[in-house]
Interface confidence: medium
């Protein structure tokens, strides 16, 4: 979690002198409670916006907007603490609006916005706005919270942001997977315009189950420049496993901008349709494919006789 660096943060508006400060997320009013505290924010809204840094990079940001209730407690409102919590890491970042002048009622409702918290693709956040000073220990809460889910890099607007482009969002491999026969699976995909290697992970599952009964990793060396944007195909040798029939193929690129953390693309081949009178399936789960000459052991990572070609 971080703040967008593009310019000085402002919270002043006509009728209010205000400054934005970094916050430890532990306002002084927690430690030294006040007798009179303002009411909670009203109509907290969080939206996905996009903003450029000074360097011209485009980032997704949380656009936070709220209004004040029209009660006399605004006379005691000294500011607000904005907190963003990333739910999967428990990382929290806060800023504080410090009002340098007293708020007065005016003909329209006071409205505040802040759009400088940079958020990550495919992450969920809890956004909280606390009015300051915070309430006494048993006082009514004067904050409002909302959860905010950031779309992943498949989202049209997200796809062109710097974090998504860095993780390879512009690459569309257009994967096709075809069962050639009971022992062979053919994977076709489009190479990107970078001389980097790829990894194909084949994971097979029994019909209707999520425990893998087969896993195999295949390495594809870096293509030459003349092969960029061309179709590449790989033929993977399977074993005719009874019941181990649903195959998921995942392609992981290793682009220089994202290394081990590039976006992975996958495609799935479903189990064939059951005939009207199916053969009885034994209650055991066979595992692996026959050894081929190039393979050291038959196991989860170096099943032999997979090979690949690049098409022009």
């Amino acid at each position: 979690l971080r703040l967008l660096d593009h310019r000085a943060l402002v919270c002043s508006q006509p009728g209010l002198n205000c400054t934005v400060k970094n916050s430890t997320c532990l306002d002084d009013s927690w430690i030294h409670p006040r007798n009179l505290t303002p009411s909670s924010p009203k109509d907290l809204q969080i939206q996905l916006h996009f903003a450029h840094t000074q360097q011209g990079d485009l980032f997704p940001v949380a656009h936070i907007e709220w209004t004040l209730q029209t009660d006399a407690s605004i006379l005691y409102l000294e500011g607000a603490e904005l907190s963003v919590l990333q739910l999967n890491t428990n990382e929290r970042l806060c800023v504080r609006f410090e009002f340098l002048s007293k708020l007065r009622h005016h003909h329209r409702r006071w409205r505040f916005t802040f759009s400088h918290f940079v958020v990550d693709p495919d992450q969920e956040y809890e956004v909280t706005v606390h009015h300051l000073p915070k309430p006494i220990p048993d006082g009514d809460p004067n904050h409002q919270s909302k959860n905010f889910l950031v779309p992943d890099c498949e989202h049209a607007r997200m796809k062109v942001t710097t974090p998504c482009m860095s993780s390879g969002s512009l690459w569309d491999p257009n994967i096709t997977v075809e069962t050639l026969d009971t022992q062979h699976l053919r994977v076709d995909f489009t190479l990107w315009n970078e001389s980097t290697h790829y990894q194909i992970l084949l994971t097979s599952f029994p019909h209707m189950e999520n425990h893998s009964c087969f896993e195999h990793m295949h390495h594809i060396p870096a293509p030459r420049p003349e092969e960029f944007h061309q179709r590449s195909n790989v033929t993977l040798t399977l074993r005719n496993l009874k019941g181990c029939c649903r195959h998921q193929v995942q392609i992981q690129p290793f682009f220089s901008s994202c290394l081990n953390d590039c976006l992975r693309h996958s495609a799935t081949v479903s189990c064939p349709e059951m005939p009207d009178t199916p053969e009885p399936i034994p209650d055991y789960m066979p595992l692996w494919e026959p050894r081929s000459g190039s393979s050291d052991y038959k196991d989860d990572d170096d099943k032999g006789s997979s090979h690949h070609h690049h098409h022009h």
């Epitope: 893998s212 896993e215 995942q250 055991y284 789960m285 692996w288 050894r291």
Partner: antibody, heavy 116, light 107 residues
Framework: QVQLVQSGAEVKKPGASVKVSCKAS????????ISWVRQAPGQGLEWMGW????????NYAQKLQGRVTMTTDTSTSTAYMELRSLRSDDTAVYYC?????????WGQGTLVTVSS | EIVMTQSPATLSVSPGERATLSCRAS??????LAWFQQKPGQAPRPLIY???TRATGVPARFSGSGSGTDFTLTISSLQSEDFAVYYC?????????FGGGTKVEIK
């Protein structure tokens, strides 16, 4: 050369949990799965389960389902096996081994003693 | 699950003699069978995989044969360092299962 180095011996009370680590070196950790096998004193070998170091997929022995959790930390090339609700018959040497099916390298073993 | 049965439980052999160890599966495991050697206080050591292929660094006196349900590990001429417990293991079906072991001792 390939090495799997396991954490030290543990003594636990019934009902407690134990977490055994297995640090791999000498090869690319995410290319090979890690399996766990245990051996009770004077007894044979018992397969406990397997974890894919690449995808995180797991497959556990039916009798341990619900009590065992296998995890990996690819940043340190370490696999972990946690066993909960320990009973006296869980007293055994616990081995990690490389690969999913046929085990070509083994850790030195970790003795876990469960005793009140 | 597939039950692996090893026989005999103990085999007494003199150094230099031939030792033949048997492993039987309760149903076919094709050639998906491995043999391991274990000495007291040590981890198992891989000897054979795919029923008949020697693992890296394993002496030629160790050989494996069989497919389906019946498998054999043969040590052509026992050396002093070969006295140990030997386990077979099938990896054709989940759960993976081991035989109970054969102890090869000095006669």
């Amino acid at each position: 050369q390939v090495q799997l180095v396991q954490s030290g011996a543990e003594v636990k009370k019934p009902g407690a949990s134990v977490k055994v680590s297995c640090k791999a070196s000498g090869y690319t950790f995410t290319r090979y799965g890690i399996s766990w096998v245990r051996q009770a004193p004077g007894q044979g070998l018992e397969w406990m389960g397997w974890i894919s170091t690449y995808s995180g997929n797991t497959n556990y022995a039916q009798k341990l389902q619900g009590r065992v959790t296998m995890t990996t930390d690819t940043s340190t090339s370490t696999a972990y096996m946690e066993l909960r609700s320990l009973r006296s018959d869980d007293t055994a040497v616990y081995y990690c081994a490389r690969r999913q099916l046929y085990f070509d390298y083994w850790g030195q073993g970790t003795l876990v003693t469960v005793s009140s | 699950e597939i039950v692996m049965t090893q026989s005999p439980a103990t085999l007494s052999v003199s150094p230099g003699e031939r030792a033949t160890l048997s492993c039987r599966a309760s149903q076919s495991v094709s050639s998906n069978l491995a043999w391991f050697q274990q000495k007291p206080g040590q981890a198992p050591r891989p000897l054979i995989y795919d029923a008949s292929t020697r693992a890296t660094g394993v002496p030629a006196r160790f050989s494996g044969s069989g497919s389906g349900t019946d498998f054999t590990l043969t040590i052509s001429s026992l050396q002093s360092e070969d006295f140990a417990v030997y386990y077979c293991q099938q990896y054709d079906n989940w759960p993976l299962t081991f035989g109970g072991g054969t102890k090869v001792e000095i006669k």
